[in-house]
Structures are given as structure tokens and as C-alpha cells.
């Protein structure tokens, strides 16, 4: 008898404990990705940025994977998702093609199943860069709550990529679980 | 045979009521602290805030520690770090000695163990702000996820800090844990 | 007994299932409301938006209320809010009144029970959008982490509302509950 | 050092307008903002007016607007005060002074030039 | 604008002697943003203490300022006879920015 009870209660530690590791907030996927400025392209144009660490200084991912540029998702749920993009221009860095830039971050979703790619969130401003200053420097950062389903995928787009700040506190995006979907 | 099942199943409440607890969500760490503008520094270059409200308005705190300027992580893991500071300034509030202003903001992770700090988010703005508009305002806001260790403390550096906006919902900072780590 | 033993694990794994329906994270409450331009307030006085949607595209709510253009909050505990405001301004949609514009947000939590409303979180800038660019654009991200009870509720004024820019990427806001209050 | 002689100082009719300059050495001129602050015989100090490095904003008393310009020649490190329309209450020692440059709005003077008198009579 | 009134208009002290100067502003100066000038007759003034409390460079120890909000404080402790002068503060936390009429540390 007390034997069985033993069975008994182990059966229900050890669902519970399955339970607890599924609903654990350890299992929670994020990713926080920190440009990698090897490969900026140039130009004014809008661009994707591909080369993102994601495993060095601050940056960081789990339950998560970084492919061809783009951040997947491998777990359904609803996500914070955020970026902070930093440009800037300094004179010894050669004269600027136009005083008047748009300085533009997009946070685009692709689909595989359905190819398609939508903006989720973009962010910016029009900047008149003058010559008269030596610095120049401008921040975005946008964030918002949204639906991800396994196998969809993040990616960023801006223009001017050749004023990026390079720096990993400068120039990052990234995302984290906060609940399933109902 | 009765009380001996009883007392296995208190056992087995126990333990999970004690999981309970420790998971949670009201066990997680947090703050929200907000600008003291009673005693900012007047100079334009880069300076660490060190006044911050904890327990007035919208300011909080939870499983955290404010000291000597300073958030301090308690407990480890992986947390939201956010930041909004604004900077205005009007004719009255004095005379702009240059109209060329970099407006910025620094996140620093300080570790005592190995005495190191780090800029884990910045974000900002050069500005002209001209002497022909009585009044100029701009907000930076930055966020990003980091993973924390117990006893790392976080600070934040702001140039030109004698022009904060000294309002709760314009200049605060914050973190809140995510989740644990792996 | 043996029926007797199962039934006591039945009532411990129906009390833990309860415990766990309730910190399931499914059960956080969230909104992502996007801009409904129908019926944007023309002016560059300070309006409060009451126009977004809730239930199309990128927007969606749970265990929160939209009504009357506020995002009413139904279950107590502290949430992580956000907004980003973009405005934008091209030459084909007529002159500037005047080129001396500040483009803010304030998002406002108010209380029913002591009528009352108080802004949370603040950003914006003052801008000079002169006649010698043909478009502009500016956007605002602000986010921060607030004790919320049921019936508050919260709302976004902004300045300038006729530059506000429609798309649901560009001028949305947010919550989602990240813990209970202790 | 940084050294600040003014001059251009002298008697003049009511009504009537004089020029003072101040030559600045010793520092990065373009880079400070800088001011005019009087002192009338027997008494205390008054800020007059200041310019901002480049030149780009300027600031005036309310007891002179409309009547005095400031400007700078910053390839002459030179700061310059156009005072017209003259008035009595306008005699005074005129000293020219240098912003400390490490605040963002102008704030205390340092150090002074040692003062050119206006005198204003008929 | 702020008005700045400082007392006593005159102190008359010995060397040695610890001196006290007031200026209290008609209305709060933000930031502690206030400064402290010394000038003797014939010449220009010289800065003594800014924002509150900071000795300008070369000013020796004896020489500390205090306060914030409305009243401020100049202390010399030890009176040397080169000190005696016309002490002026001035506030920048608004514009314009404003002297105080002047405070006469005369030797007894």
C-alpha cells in the first residue's frame, strides 16, 4: 500500500515537473543581436542588414535562430520585439552626397509559408545634416507587442546604412517571449 | 494508512506550493525610477545621474536596490532594461551658450567583482538649437534585453544634464526580470 | 484505499491544474492598438486620439477593453506600456501654417473611481520643418513598466494630430502584463 | 592666458552711437561664448548682452534691446558692441567677459577683460 | 527676472575674523546655479565660486560658498587683508542672467 502511494505521488511530482519545466520562465526564447559592421553596405538606398553577432559581448540568443540574416522564430507566442539603430557622421569621414538625409529603420516580418514580407514597426526622422558641424548623430528606437508563429522570420531594414554606428550599445535589435497564444 | 496519504500529500503540496512561490510572477524584480532634479549638475559634458526617486509618483521598486545612484541586481537573470530621458529648454531657463548640442544617453553596467563598466544602450541626438525659438524639446528613449548577474549595478550618463526635463514621465528609467537564466 | 489514494491525488493534481490556469502566461492580459486615420482631429493643438484599432492587422487585445479610445485595463498588475508616434509631412499635402512645430506624446493613465488623469510617459521634439525639403518625418518611441488596476484606463494625446503618419507600423501602442502586485 | 582688452570706450552725446571691441587671446575663441556686463559709477554689475561661439544666437538686457548689437569676428577673435541711441543711464565701465564654456546654457563670467568707460553726456 | 538682494550692505571685520555674506533670490535658483565674485577698487572682478559651492581655480580654501533654492552663503573663514573688497553674487538658472547689489567687507 504504501508503496503504491509512493507510485502515486511520484506520478504526480514528476507531471508536475513537466509542467513546471514546460511553464518555466527559463524556457522563454529571446534573442538580443548587435550589428556586425564588417559588411555594411552603402549607399542612401533602403537595404536589409544581414550580418547581426549573435553570441559575442551583449549579444545573446536562445530557443531562437539567426539565419541569412533574418532572427526565426521556433516557438509560437506573442513577443516584445525592439530595435535601437544609431547613425552618425563625422567630418573626417568625408563629406556627407546630401545635407538632407532620411534616416529610416523598418522591422519587417517574412513568412515562409506564405512568402510575403510586412512591416511591423518603423521609426525615424528627416535630418538636415549641415556641413557647419563636424558630429553628427542620430538614434532611433521602436518597439511593439506582437503575434509569431514557428518558422516566421525578423529582419531590419534601413536606409543610409553607411552612417550606421557600429558600436553594440549603438545599433541592435531583438525580441523576447512574454505569453503563449490562447 | 489514511494520515500516512495525507502526509505525502502534504508533501507534495508543499514542494510545489514552494515552486509556486518561487516562479511566481510576483517574485520578479523590478523599478521604475524617476528624475530628482534637485541638485543637477550645470556642466554640458557627460555625467552620471545620481538622484532618482524609488518611492514617489510613478517610481517603484521590487527586488531590486536603489544605492549611491545606482539600480543593483539582486537576483540573476535576464531583464528588459528601458530608459526615456527628455531634455528641454526655454529662453527663460537661461541663455544657450552653443546652439550645437549633443543630446545623449548612456546605459552603463558597473560589476564590482571584476571593477568594470560598460555602455549596454545609447541613443541621442546633436540638435541646433537656435536662439530664435523661445522654447526646444527632444526625447530619447532606448531599451534593450540584457542578462544580469546579483550585485551588477546600472547607471545612467547623460551629456548636457542641466538641460533634463525634471517631470516624472519625461526623464526615468527602469528594468524588469524576463526570465530566469538557463 | 486505493480509490481513497486516488482521489487525494486528484484533488492535489486538480488544485495544481487551478494554480496553474491561473500563472499560466496565456493568461496576461495585452493590446497592440494601431492608428485608425478615419477620423484624425485636424490643428496643432493637443488632442487626444480615440480612433485605433484593435482587432485588424498588427492590432489585437486580451483581457483588456477598448472603449471610447481607452485602452481600459481589467485585471490589477504592472505592465510594460509603449507607444511610438510617427509624424510626417510631404509638400503635395499643402504649406506648413508654420514651420516651428513640436511633435509630442503623452500617454495618460485615468482613474474612474477619484476622476482623475495623469500622464505616465512623455516624448517628442521640437522641429523645424522648412519649405526647402519637400518631405519630412519624425517618429517617437516611448515605453515604460506601471502599476495599473482594473477600470484605469489609458489614452494617447499627441500635438500636431493632421501630420500623423496612418500606417500600423508607424503610430500604434501597447501593454502587456508582465507581473501581478504583490 | 587667456587675455580680453576692450576698447572704443569714450564720451559721446545722447542720442549719439559708439563701436566697443574686445581682442581675446589665449584660448580657441570660436569655441566660448561671450558677454558684455557693465557697472555704472558707485554701483553694482549688470549683464548687458552675450553671443553664442558662433556667432549664431545673441542675447540682449531688456534695458537695451532694440538699441545695442552684439556680434563676433571669430577670424579676428574680436567681440564687438554696436551701441546706438545712447542715453545717460547707459554711462558706465564696460567689461567684456568669456563664458566658462563647460555649461550649455551661459552662465558665470571668467575671467573679465579690465573695462573701457562709456560716458554718456551733453 | 530673479532679483538677487544680499546683506548686510556692509561688514566691517577685523583680519582674522570670519565673514558671512548672504544673497537671498526673490524666487528659487534652479540647480544651485549661482556664483560669487570678489572686486576690488579700479578693477575687474574675479570669480570666486560657481554653481553653489565649486572654488573657482587659484581661489584659496578659506573661501566656500553654500545653500540652494532661495539663500546662499559666502564664508570666509579666516579674513586675510587682501580679502577686503565687494563681493557680488549672480544668478544664470534664468534669464536674464542678475547681479546682487553688493556686499562691502571693510576692515574694522
Known amino acids: 500500500g504504501s508503496q503504491h502511494i509512493r507510485a502515486e505521488k511520484a506520478m504526480v511530482d514528476g507531471s508536475w515537473l513537466d509542467l513546471a519545466k514546460r511553464s518555466k520562465l527559463e524556457a522563454q526564447p529571446f534573442a538580443h543581436l548587435t550589428i556586425n559592421a564588417t559588411d555594411i553596405p552603402s549607399g542612401s538606398h533602403k537595404v536589409s542588414l544581414s550580418s547581426w553577432y549573435h553570441d559575442r559581448g551583449w549579444a545573446k540568443i536562445s530557443n531562437m535562430t539567426f539565419s541569412n540574416g533574418k532572427l526565426i522564430v521556433n516557438q509560437d507566442g506573442f513577443y516584445y520585439l525592439y530595435a535601437n539603430i544609431c547613425f552618425r557622421h563625422h567630418e573626417t569621414s568625408g563629406d556627407l552626397a546630401t545635407e538632407y538625409l532620411q534616416l529610416m529603420v523598418y522591422v519587417t516580418k517574412t513568412s515562409i509559408k506564405i512568402p510575403s514580407s510586412h512591416t511591423l514597426m518603423k521609426g525615424g526622422s528627416t535630418k538636415y545634416w549641415s556641413g557647419n558641424s563636424e558630429f553628427h548623430f542620430y538614434s532611433i528606437n521602436v518597439g511593439g507587442f506582437f503575434k509569431l508563429r514557428s518558422g516566421e522570420e525578423i529582419s531590419i531594414e534601413v536606409s543610409n546604412p553607411s552612417l550606421l554606428d557600429p558600436d553594440q550599445d549603438a545599433t541592435y535589435f531583438g525580441a523576447f517571449k512574454v505569453r503563449d497564444i490562447d | 494508512g489514511s494520515q500516512h496519504i495525507r502526509a505525502e500529500k502534504a508533501m507534495v503540496d508543499g514542494s510545489w506550493l514552494d515552486l509556486a512561490k518561487r516562479s511566481k510572477l510576483e517574485a520578479q524584480p523590478f523599478a521604475h525610477l524617476t528624475i530628482n532634479a534637485t541638485d543637477i549638475p550645470s556642466g554640458s559634458h557627460k555625467v552620471s545621474l545620481s538622484s532618482w526617486y524609488h518611492d514617489r509618483g510613478w517610481a517603484k521598486i521590487s527586488n531590486m536596490t536603489f544605492s549611491n545612484g545606482k539600480l543593483i541586481v539582486n537576483q540573476d537573470g535576464f531583464y528588459y532594461l528601458y530608459a526615456n530621458i527628455c531634455f528641454r529648454h526655454h529662453e527663460t531657463s537661461g541663455d544657450l551658450a552653443t546652439e550645437y548640442l549633443q543630446l545623449m544617453v548612456y546605459v552603463t553596467k558597473t560589476s564590482i567583482k571584476i571593477p568594470s563598466s560598460h555602455t549596454l544602450m545609447k541613443g541621442g541626438s546633436t540638435k541646433y538649437w537656435s536662439g530664435n525659438s523661445e522654447f526646444h524639446f527632444y526625447s530619447i528613449n532606448v531599451g534593450g534585453f540584457f542578462k544580469l548577474r546579483s550585485g551588477e549595478e546600472i547607471s545612467i550618463e547623460v551629456s548636457n544634464p542641466s538641460l533634463l526635463d525634471p517631470d516624472q514621465d519625461a526623464t526615468y528609467f527602469g528594468a524588469f526580470k524576463v526570465r530566469d537564466i538557463d | 484505499g486505493s480509490q481513497h489514494i486516488r482521489a487525494e491525488k486528484a484533488m492535489v493534481d486538480g488544485s495544481w491544474l487551478d494554480l496553474a490556469k491561473r500563472s499560466k502566461l496565456e493568461a496576461q492580459p495585452f493590446a497592440h492598438l494601431t492608428i485608425n486615420a478615419t477620423d484624425i482631429p485636424s490643428g496643432s493643438h493637443k488632442v487626444s486620439l480615440s480612433s485605433w484599432y484593435h482587432d485588424r492587422g498588427w492590432a489585437k487585445i486580451s483581457n483588456m477593453t477598448f472603449s471610447n479610445g481607452k485602452l481600459i485595463v481589467n485585471q490589477d498588475g504592472f505592465y510594460y506600456l509603449y507607444a511610438n508616434i510617427c509624424f510626417r509631412h510631404h509638400e503635395t499635402s499643402g504649406d506648413l501654417a508654420t514651420e516651428y512645430l513640436q511633435l509630442m506624446v503623452y500617454v495618460t493613465k485615468t482613474s474612474i473611481k477619484i476622476p482623475s488623469s495623469h500622464t505616465l510617459m512623455k516624448g517628442g521634439s521640437t522641429k523645424y520643418w522648412s519649405g526647402n525639403s519637400e518631405f519630412h518625418f519624425y517618429s517617437i518611441n516611448v515605453g515604460g513598466f506601471f502599476k495599473l488596476r482594473s477600470g484605469e484606463e489609458i489614452s494617447i494625446e499627441v500635438s500636431n494630430p493632421s501630420l500623423l503618419d496612418p500606417d500600423q507600423d508607424a503610430t500604434y501602442f501597447g501593454a502587456f502584463k508582465v507581473r501581478d502586485i504583490d | 592666458e587667456v587675455q580680453l582688452l576692450e576698447s572704443g570706450g569714450g564720451l559721446v552725446q545722447p542720442g549719439g552711437s559708439l563701436r566697443l571691441s574686445c581682442a581675446a587671446s589665449?584660448?580657441?575663441?570660436?569655441?566660448?561664448?561671450m558677454s558684455w556686463v557693465r557697472q555704472a559709477p558707485g554701483k553694482g554689475l549688470e549683464w548687458v548682452s552675450g553671443?553664442?561661439?558662433?556667432?549664431?544666437?545673441?542675447y540682449y538686457a531688456d534695458s537695451v534691446k532694440g538699441r545695442f548689437t552684439i556680434s563676433r569676428d571669430n577670424s579676428k577673435n574680436t567681440l564687438y558692441l554696436q551701441m546706438n541711441s545712447l542715453r545717460a543711464e547707459d554711462t558706465a565701465v564696460y567689461y567684456c567677459?568669456?563664458?566658462?564654456?563647460?555649461?550649455?546654457?551661459?552662465?558665470?563670467?571668467?575671467?573679465w577683460g579690465q573695462g573701457t568707460l562709456v560716458t554718456v553726456s551733453s | 527676472e530673479i532679483v538677487l538682494t544680499q546683506s548686510p550692505g556692509t561688514l566691517s571685520l577685523s583680519p582674522g575674523e570670519r565673514a558671512t555674506l548672504s544673497c537671498r533670490a526673490s524666487?528659487?535658483?534652479?540647480?544651485?546655479?549661482l556664483a560669487w565674485y570678489q572686486q576690488k577698487p579700479g578693477q575687474a572682478p574675479r570669480l570666486l565660486i560657481y554653481?553653489?559651492?565649486s572654488r573657482a581655480t587659484g581661489i584659496p580654501d578659506r573661501f566656500s560658498g553654500s545653500g540652494s533654492g532661495t539663500d546662499f552663503t559666502l564664508t570666509i573663514s579666516r579674513l586675510e587683508p587682501e580679502d577686503f573688497a565687494v563681493f557680488y553674487c549672480?544668478?544664470?538658472?534664468?534669464?536674464?542672467?542678475?547681479f546682487g547689489q553688493g556686499t562691502k567687507v571693510e576692515i574694522k
Open positions: 567677459a568669456k563664458d566658462p564654456g563647460t555649461t550649455v546654457i551661459m552662465s558665470w563670467f571668467d575671467p
Open positions: 589665449g584660448f580657441t575663441f570660436s569655441s566660448y561664448a
Open positions: 553671443i553664442t561661439g558662433s556667432g549664431g544666437s545673441t
Open positions: 524666487q528659487s535658483v534652479r540647480g544651485r546655479y
Open positions: 554653481q553653489g559651492s
Open positions: 549672480q544668478q544664470y538658472g534664468s534669464s536674464p542672467r542678475t
